[in-house]
């Protein structure tokens, strides 16, 4: 659900942290229509996720912790 590097909607799937290598934040006030977390997966896919959803926050927290501990 992305176009010109902007997410236009959100995935309706839940991803496991083991599938994700990193993420990018998309902000609505920076040229895109919606706030989103763009997850980058091990299969080189970019997945647009809703930053308000619990599972998304959980993975962002996990990945942020990992980066901090590096």
């Amino acid at each position: 659900a992305s176009n010109f590097d902007c997410c236009l909607g959100y995935t309706d799937r839940i991803l496991h942290p083991k599938f994700i290598v990193g993420f990018t934040r998309q902000l609505a006030n920076e040229g895109c229509d919606i706030n989103a977390i763009i997850f980058h997966t091990k299969k080189k896919l970019s997945v647009c996720a809703n930053p308000k959803q619990t599972w998304v926050k959980y993975i962002v927290r996990l990945l942020s912790k990992k980066v901090k501990n590096m």
Epitope: I14, H16, K42, Y58
Partner: antibody
């Protein structure tokens, strides 16, 4: 201790709907997902869908979209699944099960299951 | 959707033996795999999570291994109490999918 209480059985007529409950106790209801799983007699397990009680976010197995509707009542720590337009294919045991993303997204506690029989 | 294939579908072994159940995924699931035990007339119980971690309260005779697309569950020194159906489950991405199950009986 963690408990998920489900009614034992439901007998319903073809074409009707049924709404089954799953009352959670022994943990903070909004901190864990609630999954629903189907098991037909002599067959394997099928994942129906999941609801996040903290915000009522749901996602379904495509096969059960339009068939199952998941809801929660956080005031009573109860999850519900409604099944509509019932046929004999819907006769099965339905389990609610707690989803724990802290334990590798596993379903770490299961209800006893509600046996649904669709018969005229 | 990711397909999970379990083998064998059924298995008969003697008390004290070691048995192995395998589970194959249609694509790499990166260790996002759980195992459940369902005894006759009971609800399923979590047995192994994250491919290798033993769930609380389960016997250390159970062990999980594997990576990528291939996983296995080993039961050592088989007990009569181990009679059950065992299921693997993919949790990499929804819809979560289960293997068809392996029914374990005692000879």
């Amino acid at each position: 201790q963690v408990q998920l209480q489900q009614p034992g059985a439901e007998l319903v007529k073809p074409g009707a709907s049924v709404k089954m409950s799953c009352k959670a106790s022994g943990y903070t209801f909004t901190n864990y997902w609630m999954h629903w799983v189907k098991q037909r007699p002599g067959q394997g397990l099928e994942w129906i869908g999941v609801i996040d009680p903290s915000d009522s976010y749901t996602t379904y197995n495509q096969k059960f979209k339009g068939k199952a509707t998941l809801t929660v009542d956080t005031s009573s720590s109860t999850a519900y699944m409604q099944l509509s337009s019932l046929t004999s294919e819907d006769s099965a045991v339905y389990y609610c099960t707690r989803g724990n993303y802290g334990v590798d997204y596993a379903m770490d506690y299961w209800g006893q299951g509600t046996s649904v029989t669709v018969s005229s | 959707d990711i397909q999970m294939t379990q083998s064998p579908a059924s298995l008969s072994a003697s008390v004290g033996e070691t048995v192995t159940i395998t589970c194959g995924a249609s694509e790499n699931i990166y260790g996002a795999l759980n195992w459940y035990q369902r005894k006759q007339g009971k609800s399923p119980q979590l047995l192994i999570y994250g491919a290798t971690n033993l769930a609380d309260g389960m016997s250390s005779r159970f062990s999980g291994s594997g990576s990528g697309r291939q996983y296995s569950l080993k039961i050592s020194s088989l007990h009569p109490d181990d009679v059950a159906t065992y299921y693997c489950q993919n949790v990499l991405i929804t819809p979560y999918t289960f293997g068809g199950g392996t029914k374990l009986e005692i000879k």
